[in-house]
Amino acid sequence: WELTILHTNDVHSRLEQTSEDSSKCVNASRCMGGVARLFTKVQQIRRAEPNVLLLDAGDQYQGTIWFTVYKGAEVAHFMNALRYDAMALGNHEFDNGVEGLIEPLLKEAKFPILSANIKAKGPLASQISGLYLPYKVLPVGDEVVGIVGYTSKETPFLSNPGTNLVFEDEITALQPEVDKLKTLNVNKIIALGHSGFEMDKLIAQKVRGVDVVVGGHSNTFLYTGNPPSKEVPAGKYPFIVTSDDGRKVPVVQAYAFGKYLGYLKIEFDERGNVISSHGNPILLNSSIPEDPSIKADINKWRIKLDNYSTQELGKTIVYLDGSSQSCRFRECNMGNLICDAMINNNLRHTDEMFWNHVSMCILNGGGIRSPIDERNNGTITWENLAAVLPFGGTFDLVQLKGSTLKKAFEHSVHRYGQSTGEFLQVGGIHVVYDLSRKPGDRVVKLDVLCTKCRVPSYDPLKMDEVYKVILPNFLANGGDGFQMIKDELLRHDSGDQDINVVSTYISKMKVIYPAVEGRIKFS
């Protein structure tokens, strides 16, 4: 019996087609992805093949103005339109709290939403009961397939699930659910989830009875043969893991942002054992036409986005200096504002010993592309912020050693004075540079805000200590020459859309007045 698994993950609000790098579509003839194009390909496969499942491995939420405005209603609507068969919860599905998951998505989705390792407690338990499930048995042709879900147990550090959801260890939670499916005579089981490729492989190895793992979170690109675009494969598709009980378990993921549709064909024997597996992600490029009815629906939903862009989010009573002569040369108050917003967006009081899990932000000055003038009645709009942060990135959480941070700050001023973009703006950091010293030895003081403290204060950076830092994905990926970050980061979790982070902060504060306050000094 042959099953075709179509899968997406980490779509992050890319409902419209995008450029090849998943930013805003500029040249339509070269654009990719989007739900209208995805639907064309899915329908084509559904017509051609008998047993097809369309699955999503989480993180539909967060990433563009679509999510900012529609808050998940767009996800439910278009996933329903594409007739997804199941979805696993990702960490970003909790970005607007549990309510922001329940109302727009869990109550509106016409497909099961899954996670076996999230357990509700207290008053939430009855409220959320039945709205998401640990597993679902789906009829496919003449057979049944069990889908069991999982979600990163780091979610409380990455999003806003509140205090009434417990995120258990994935493997510990999955095993009893898979055992339950076995007792129900379900012998074809897919683990669908959002914990990253390393955990996907562990699940394939450790959870007895799982036949296939469909993952997300790490934006992993797998491919067999010559890759069709610029993503470099982390391994073959499918990636085969030998389980502890000797089975060959295919593991797949389909990069991110709806650029590819994962396509996996599995052949099972009559006892539900995987005989063979093959496939590849399908690049959703412009050779695949956008479905006209879905496209028309997208255009209808788009209207509200254009209106939103010009509405006031909040006010500034000071000039927000995003000029290149400031932000690429010295501390600028626009950099301070953005870093403060980045930290504020990551407030998670998950441990009594820590006032917060992260206190530090770094931001390349070259990423700030416009000032905002307070003399326009102080009004700040999404449109204004899109000029400040025009590149459509995310603000991510990384873990770095102190020694890596020191290298990053040396890099910040290694060729100071040429208006180059690598000059770092900061939050939760006090740095002093001496430009009379030779490049690579210009940081004379680097103090960082403690996290394991009840009264936050600045302490000298320790070279061997591991620190959490919020930074743009551009820096996490080694942009502006920050190769040491890319090469030495110990953990990287993708975060929220940059403009969304700043707009949420401004809306929350209502009136802002960021100052230049001595975060960056020159001796």
């Epitope: 500029v26 290149s324 690429r328 592309r369 060729r415 208006s419």
Partner: antibody
Framework: EVQLVESGGGLVQPGGSLRLSCAAS????????MHWVRQAPGKGLEWVAV????????YYADSVKGRFTISRDNSKNALYLQMNSLRAEDTAVYYC??????????WGQGTLVTVSS | AIQMTQSPSSLSASVGDRVTITCRAS??????LAWYQQKPGKAPKLLIY???TLQSGVPSRFSGSGSGTDFTLTISSLQPEDFATYYC????????FGQGTRLEIK
Amino acid sequence: EVQLVESGGGLVQPGGSLRLSCAASGFTFSSYDMHWVRQAPGKGLEWVAVMSYDGSNKYYADSVKGRFTISRDNSKNALYLQMNSLRAEDTAVYYCATEIAAKGDYWGQGTLVTVSS
Amino acid sequence: AIQMTQSPSSLSASVGDRVTITCRASQGISNYLAWYQQKPGKAPKLLIYAASTLQSGVPSRFSGSGSGTDFTLTISSLQPEDFATYYCQQSYSTPHFGQGTRLEIK
């Protein structure tokens, strides 16, 4: 679609002046640093000047310093190059480009400047 | 100013060949290096930036490597449309291009 269209080239006598323009469309012009690059007939590429997205920083190649001035008008999505005291060796196709050597790298098709008596 | 020296200045190759062009900087430029392709009468086209990052829309047969002073552009299997002139360019300080490498059909 991103478009950069240069204009203003032509024949000019040594010691004369010319003003090149570059009209930008299809992207947020005010968010991008802009460059002029030139190419003498049958020769390689030579970088000429850059201006930051907000106009507050300008840098020039030594060969044009003091003679050429780069400017921009973000309200008009336009980049300019004022060329004074022109010499025969300034004869080239002049390209305007965004953020060269980075992800947002786009070039116009160029305009020919001929300095000759 | 940082000078860029490309080699060879020209080379002949056949479709399907693996081709390597090198570029040397007169001082260390970290990974601030780009590679461009230019065809006659056309504007240059960015292939690689940050020494090894492939620009959107560029075929994966093109790859870049190197750091510091020595850099390489490799075309793994030459296609007919790849015959052109290639330039390296440093952006560590004010930009400077190499003198170019003309790649022609053998």
